[in-house]
Amino acid sequence: PTSSSTKKTQLQLEHLLLDLQMILNGINNYKNPKLTRMLTFKFYMPKKATELKHLQCLEEELKPLEEVLNLAQSKNFHLRPRDLISNINVIVLELKGSETTFMCEYADETATIVEFLNRWITFSQSIISTLT
């Protein structure tokens, strides 16, 4: 990657981070009456998430994420869940590249939507701070 492509990658990661934080803030909103129900849904967590290729694991969980977000009141988000997830999907596909043979491996234990989002927020923050 060139310095310009790395800069683009950094910007895409920042967009991804903001989108994930927006979702987390939306579902954690004290006015969200569906939060208890949303927390019953389980998400697969990556066995490891340190590099861009590990975004394969996030991509595979975007559909379930959209389904859970559809439960939330739409006023908690600036965009409809479908559009929000579509935006994230575009970023993820660009970031992880076209290494189609890379298969995700998942951790043994599943997680709530809050734990899932926090994991990918931590991932985004760490890549932003270490990508050179």
């Epitope: 990657p1 790395t6 990658t9 967590m45 066995k47 490891k48 998430a49 340190t50 590099e51 861009l52 290729k53 590249g97 290494e99 890379f102 491996e105 951790a107 931590t122 991932f123 923050q125 760490s126 890549i127 701070s129 270490t130 990508l131 050179t132």
Partner: antibody
Framework: EVQLVESGGGLVQPGGSLRLSCAAS????????LAWVRQAPGKGLEWVAA???????YSPDTVRGRFTISRDNAKNSLYLQMNSLRAEDTAVYYC???????????WGQGTTVTVSS | DIQMTQSPSSLSASVGDRVTITCKAS??????VGWYQQKPGQSPKALIY???FRYSGVPDRFTGSGSGTDFSLTISNVKSEDLAEYFC?????????FGGGTKLEIK
């Protein structure tokens, strides 16, 4: 059998440069993330840099802007270009393979870098 | 960055003893923890991954456990060849960080 063999270490003056190499064999080099980890005399281990299979590079604040990790998949080789060296960069530098889903599973024997005037 | 606090920094054991080394992460790292053995004058060797899984060829005397923030490596029936320094490492996020190490001395 997986093998990682480092070379290029030596004595260099503060402010100087050095390029370390790591020759890999026994695995599909291009599919793995590779890392450099260092160990100062009598001290613990410190992660210095990593480069993934797409050649994206990662490093901590301590070396960013001074050290550059790179790879040549055709030669099954990993490199660490070290510039603006300081006394605190004195250490044994290890090349390690980062398994896709687990820890640093194979390590080289190390090469010693001494920064001193 | 995630800090890995390892204790004790050194310990002494007799052949046949059972010893435990602990590592505490400054934040949740799931089970993304590895343990390494470094014998005098040698490079580190991977012992344990995912907190509790032994690498191929590692004797079953070495047992890793823990999740979240608290981890341990237990060596049962210590042998003279276990004389080494042991390090924990988190690979939950970059930058990877290591514990300060534990030197195991054989009496």
């Amino acid at each position: 059998e997986v093998q990682l063999v480092e070379s290029g270490g030596g004595l260099v003056q503060p402010g100087g440069s050095l390029r370390l190499s790591c020759a890999a064999s026994g695995f599909t080099f291009s599919s793995y993330t590779l890392a450099w980890v260092r160990q100062a005399p009598g001290k613990g281990l410190e992660w210095v840099a990593a480069i993934d299979s797409s050649s994206y590079t990662y490093s901590p604040d301590t070396v960013r802007g001074r050290f550059t990790i790179s790879r040549d998949n055709a030669k099954n080789s990993l490199y660490l270009q070290m510039n603006s060296l300081r006394a605190e960069d004195t250490a044994v530098y290890y090349c390690a393979r980062d398994s896709n889903w687990d820890a640093l599973d194979y390590w080289g024997q190390g090469t010693t870098v001494t920064v001193s005037s | 960055d995630i800090q890995m606090t390892q204790s004790p920094s050194s310990l002494s054991a007799s052949v046949g003893d059972r010893v435990t080394i602990t590592c505490k992460a400054s934040q949740n790292v799931g089970t993304n923890v590895g343990w390494y053995q470094q014998k005098p004058g040698q490079s580190p060797k991977a012992l344990i991954y995912s907190a509790s899984f032994r690498y191929s060829g590692v004797p079953d005397r070495f047992t890793g456990s823990g999740s979240g923030t608290d981890f341990s490596l237990t060596i049962s029936n210590v042998k003279s060849e276990d004389l080494a320094e042991y390090f924990c490492q988190q690979y939950y996020t970059y930058p990877y960080t290591f514990g300060g190490g534990t030197k195991l001395e054989i009496k």
